[in-house]
Interface confidence: low
């Protein structure tokens, strides 16, 4: 299948920053948003400044996701909550995988069966309630150049 433009990070060396992205969730058409106060949710407004994300390849197939405006890193907590922390911890790394439908999934490296996901309401989905095959875990990386 064709890759989304700059869709995967696996080919990039560790530490490589790619162009900022917006992560569009197939479930309800929301963009992953990281607020300056650390909250994480989804929004449909594609010009919202808080959906501009910096994906950095930590190692092959593993990325951190930083909110450019919030200056915070997406993190999966041990209770399944998604929030954004001011500094990088081991909870801030995700396995990025291109699925056969051209969408990416982001699975926690620390809590390996939990995925980044958004509900149809735009709220994040608890990691403990996510799993393979769910629409909520599918994200399309889009250019955020503007």
């Amino acid at each position: 299948p064709a890759l989304p433009e700059d869709g995967g990070s696996g080919a990039f060396p560790p530490g490589h920053f790619k162009d900022p992205k917006r992560l569009y969730c197939k479930n309800g058409g929301f963009f992953l948003r990281i607020h300056p106060d650390g909250r994480v949710d989804g929004v449909r407004e594609k010009s919202d400044p808080h959906i501009k994300l910096q994906l950095q390849a930590e190692e092959r197939g593993v990325v951190s996701i930083k909110g450019v405006c919030a200056n915070r890193y997406l993190a999966m907590k041990e209770d399944g909550r998604l929030l954004a922390s001011k500094c990088v911890t081991d909870e801030c790394f995700f396995f990025e995988r291109l699925e056969s439908n051209n969408y990416n999934t982001y699975r926690s490296r620390k809590y390996t069966s939990w995925y980044v996901a958004l509900k149809r309401t735009g709220q994040y989905k608890l990691g403990s309630k996510t799993g393979p095959g769910q629409k909520a875990i599918l994200f399309l990386p889009m250019s955020a150049k503007s």
Partner: antibody, heavy 120, light 110 residues
Framework: QVQLQESGGGLVQPGGSLRLSCAAS????????MNWVRQAPGKGLEWVSY????????YYADSVKGRFTISRDNAKNSLYLQMNSLRAEDTAVYYC?????????????WGQGTMVTVSS | QSVLTQPASVSGSPGQSITISCTGT?????????VSWYQQHPGKAPKLMIY???NRPSGVSNRFSGSKSGNTASLTISGLQAEDEADYYC??????????FGGGTKLTVL
């Protein structure tokens, strides 16, 4: 019902200016991203410009960049296209189009169009 | 000239199926799942028939379907009817945050 109505088209000389308006009704205009699309006589569709729901983000086709300005007034449920330095190749029917929520480049509601003729 | 390439015309008899192709690049059609298809009858505004490659808006007949492979998207109309005779345009989001259209395909129902 959901409706878009363009106005402001007409005959203008090369180098002249024109301001198109698009009146929206039947939906919450301030929640939607909007676009202008044009179609020259007997030709295909050409995307012209995009504006976000708040008006904070704007994009233009290269062919109109620096000459056209898109804007909106959410209080008046109106979309505008200010066209300056008009050229013969700008002659077309201009449509305003609503963008499908959460999508990119899918226009679900269109106006009936307004004709702009640039000729001396 | 149009960025996306479509055949200038296609034709088919009532009841038949036809497919219209739309070829772009990895910066538009191939790079994103944001391909739309529009139907336009003479003197009328375009009508959205397919979005996100294969989704139909409510009210659009299930005889219309969309797909994509690599840099080429396709619109298939099955059970062709006289009222399907129109111009069809594809469009795609691009990596420069713009939208591009195909040149259009005139469908004739024989």
């Amino acid at each position: 019902q959901v409706q878009l109505q363009e106005s402001g088209g007409g005959l203008v000389q090369p180098g002249g200016s024109l301001r198109l308006s698009c009146a929206a009704s039947g939906f919450t205009f301030s929640s939607y991203e909007m676009n202008w699309v044009r179609q020259a006589p007997g030709k295909g569709l050409e995307w012209v410009s995009y504006i976000s729901s708040s008006g904070s983000t704007i994009y233009y086709a290269d062919s109109v960049k620096g000459r056209f300005t898109i804007s909106r007034d959410n209080a008046k449920n109106s979309l505008y296209l200010q066209m300056n330095s008009l050229r013969a190749e700008d002659t077309a029917v201009y449509y305003c189009a609503r963008e499908l929520t959460g999508d990119w480049g899918a226009f679900d509601i269109w106006g009936q169009g307004t004709m702009v003729t640039v000729s001396s | 000239q149009s960025v996306l390439t479509q055949p200038a015309s296609v034709s088919g008899s009532p009841g038949q199926s036809i497919t219209i192709s739309c070829t772009g690049t990895s910066s538009d059609v191939g790079g994103y799942n944001y391909v739309s298809w529009y139907q336009q009858h003479p003197g009328k505004a375009p009508k959205l028939m397919i979005y996100d490659v294969s989704n139909r808006p409510s009210g659009v007949s299930n005889r219309f379907s969309g797909s994509k492979s690599g840099n080429t998207a396709s619109l298939t109309i099955s059970g062709l009817q006289a009222e399907d005779e129109a111009d069809y345009y594809c469009s795609s989001y691009t990596s420069s945050s713009t939208v591009v259209f195909g040149g259009g395909t005139k469908l004739t129902v024989l």
